[in-house]
């Protein structure tokens, strides 16, 4: 290299990461093998579980607002699960990204898209539940499957928008030991007049914005919605939470537990720009917490099934029946203060009595897409006891 050849500018933390060399330590190799095995298994499980959830919820169940939320959550998780095999490959080849810069950007973007989509969708689910209880009349008139799909599309658009910086600033960086990193390079685009200042401000901006938008704000919305619902239900004298409430609680808890550590380390990483002493902690911890965040996509489908109160009995029946019993709106199970007659009419507004793929009206948006993707959905759906009951009452 000539004396005046300008090297690719890297932030100090990134350059130091590029200097880290691999160990040939036997115990570390065993950990690597275990990690590959674990991620491989998670990839397989995630794809199968979320695929099954999408198929069952999208094609074998009567569409409600609740199933719409779950459908989109499962779609987000399926995307994340689909990217896991490539992360597994990265681990298998010795923590080196051999799939090129474009795929590095795409792969990472899926991770962040899932992060934002999950946070936004869980917020929407909580707000939906809150509106049902706090504004029941408004919910009865406006809470439709079509509206829920529209909300989901807006949330997906917001998630994509928030993912753009992570796509732009993702890059492949050659390490000094020959391996390739797929990581943030915030100096990739318009580094500005001062790289130190740019590194610091952009790293902090990315870490803080994703912490706020994908974690803190959704959790605040979820917590305040839950508080509002609890207060209202206390006045109505209802004690036992509905099945859907338990499902949401489990999914939110999993979200907080899986994504919380990731955001903590992400903020530490931003702080490590000015405090190099934090860097070793970040380098050791970040791979683990990133994997934990990925595993959230594998955990969710399990939670959809496990939160069913009489799980063991219902697991003997079809998976569809289990899910159907879990994913019924509280309003459809006779929330406090609602009569059977009113419940029937609201059900007619918020859901078609037939399953997604054989509804008389043409399915819209993601539902149509799923119907097309899953050709077998064209078959007439099995009708569960709940569906039969609702079909007879709302016809």
């Amino acid at each position: 290299m000539s004396a005046n050849a300008t090297l690719k500018p890297l932030c100090p933390i990134l350059e130091q990461m590029s200097r880290l060399q691999s160990h040939s330590n036997t115990s570390i190799r065993y950990i690597d093998h275990a990690a590959v095995l674990l991620h491989g298994l998670a990839s397989l499980l995630g794809l199968v579980e979320n695929g099954v959830i999408l198929f069952v919820v999208g094609c074998r169940m009567r569409q409600t607002v609740v199933t719409t939320w779950v459908l989109h959550l499962a779609l987000s998780d399926l995307l994340a699960s689909a990217s896991l095999p490539f992360f597994t490959y990265f681990l298998a080849v010795g923590h080196s990204w051999e799939l090129g810069t474009t795929f590095c950007k795409l792969h990472s973007s899926i991770f962040f898209l899932n992060m934002f989509a999950s946070g936004f969708l869980l917020s929407a689910i909580s707000l939906d539940r809150c509106l049902q209880v706090v504004r029941p009349v408004w919910a009865q008139n406006h809470r439709t499957v079509a509206a829920a799909h529209k909300v989901c599309l807006v949330l997906w658009a917001l998630a994509v928008l928030n993912t753009v910086p992570y796509f732009v600033f993702r890059d492949t960086i050659s390490r000094l030991d020959g391996r390739i990193m797929c990581y943030y390079n915030v100096l990739l685009l318009n580094p500005g007049p001062d790289r130190d200042a740019t590194c610091n401000s952009r790293q902090v901006a990315l870490a803080v914005s994703k912490f706020l938008l994908a974690f803190l704000v959704p959790l605040a919305i979820i917590a305040s919605s839950h508080a509002a619902v609890s207060l209202r239900l206390q006045h109505r004298g209802r004690r036992r939470p509905g099945r859907f409430v338990r499902l949401v609680a489990a999914v939110v808890a999993a979200f907080a537990l899986c994504w919380g550590p990731y955001h903590v380390f992400s903020l530490l990483e931003a702080r490590a720009h000015a405090n190099p002493g934090l860097r070793p902690l970040v380098w050791r911890g970040l791979p683990f917490v990133t994997s934990l965040a990925f595993f959230n996509s594998v955990a969710n489908p399990v939670l959809y099934v496990l939160t069913c109160p009489d799980m063991l009995r219902k697991l003997r029946r079809s998976l569809r029946t289990v899910l159907e019993s879990v994913l019924v709106d509280d309003s459809e199970l006779g929330g406090a203060g609602s009569s059977r007659r009113r419940r029937t009419s609201s059900t007619a507004r918020s859901a078609s009595p037939l399953a997604l793929c054989s509804r008389p009206e043409e399915p819209r948006g993601p539902a149509r897409l799923l119907g097309w993707l899953l050709g077998s959905c064209a078959a007439s759906p099995q009708t569960g006891p709940l569906n039969r009951a609702l079909s007879s009452t709302s016809s």
Partner: antibody, heavy 118, light 107 residues
Framework: EVQLVESGGGLVQPGGSLRLSCAAS????????MSWVRQAPGKGLEWVAR????????DYPGTVEGRFTISRDNSKNTLYLQMNSLRAEDTAVYYC???????????WGQGTLVTVSS | DIQMTQSPSSLSASVGDRVTITCRAS??????LAWYQQKPGKAPKLVVY???QLADGVPSRFSGSGSGTDYTLTISSLQPEDFATYYC?????????FGQGTKVEIK
């Protein structure tokens, strides 16, 4: 060809001040981080100050913090070291050095001697 | 501050000899180490950066190795132009300190 030429050294009394300059040529000065390194007569090397490529960030060791100030003028391709409250132990040859990336000094000037004595 | 301890402080060797200079940091510096060569009355010259990477224009007889706290500069076959003082320097956490130097003299 990369060139770094220091100037401004000389004899100064304890407590006095001095401003060193380093004229850079042969490379895009505004792209590189820069440092000052000194070497007392017959002794080892000591890093004195660092400045980011745009001049927003500076770093110093405790021995000179508060007394020395590093700055740069990218339009003039010049690096500066303002030395105040000079002590006898500041006597040394002062080198300006270019950072290869964020670290590692790949090019050095020939040095300028600063003598602090009464 | 991180202390850098170089050993030996001086050594005598002949042309063609294999020479090894070690540098020990008081804490892990994660390969953030450079080696410099300085001849009398001259400015230092970068030999190795990032512990193992040879700087531009440096002959392949020079090599750097090590990890954690212990690092080594090796000259596989000493040449007349290699007689000089060698310094290690860490770039982990400021202040970036140098070793006290190793003077390689002709035997």
């Amino acid at each position: 060809e990369v060139q770094l030429v220091e100037s401004g050294g000389g004899l100064v009394q304890p407590g006095g001040s001095l401003r060193l300059s380093c004229a850079a040529s042969g490379f895009t000065f505004s792209f590189y981080l820069m440092s000052w390194v000194r070497q007392a007569p017959g002794k080892g090397l000591e890093w004195v100050a660092r400045i980011s490529n745009g001049g927003s960030t500076t770093d110093y060791p405790g021995t000179v913090e508060g007394r020395f100030t590093i700055s740069r003028d990218n339009s003039k391709n010049t690096l500066y070291l303002q030395m105040n409250s000079l002590r006898a132990e500041d006597t040394a040859v002062y080198y300006c050095a270019r950072h290869r990336t964020n670290w590692d000094f790949d090019y050095w000037g020939q040095g300028t001697l600063v003598t602090v004595s009464s | 501050d991180i202390q850098m301890t170089q050993s030996p402080s001086s050594l005598s060797a002949s042309v063609g000899d294999r020479v090894t200079i070690t540098c020990r940091a008081s804490e892990n510096i994660y390969w953030n180490l450079a080696w410099y060569q300085q001849k009398p009355g001259k400015a230092p010259k970068l030999v190795v950066y990032a512990a193992t990477q040879l700087a531009d224009g440096v002959p392949s007889r020079f090599s750097g190795s090590g990890s954690g706290t212990d690092y080594t500069l090796t000259i596989s076959s000493l040449q007349p132009e290699d007689f000089a003082t060698y310094y290690c320097q860490h770039f982990w956490i400021t202040p970036w300190t140098f070793g006290q130097g190793t003077k390689v003299e002709i035997k």
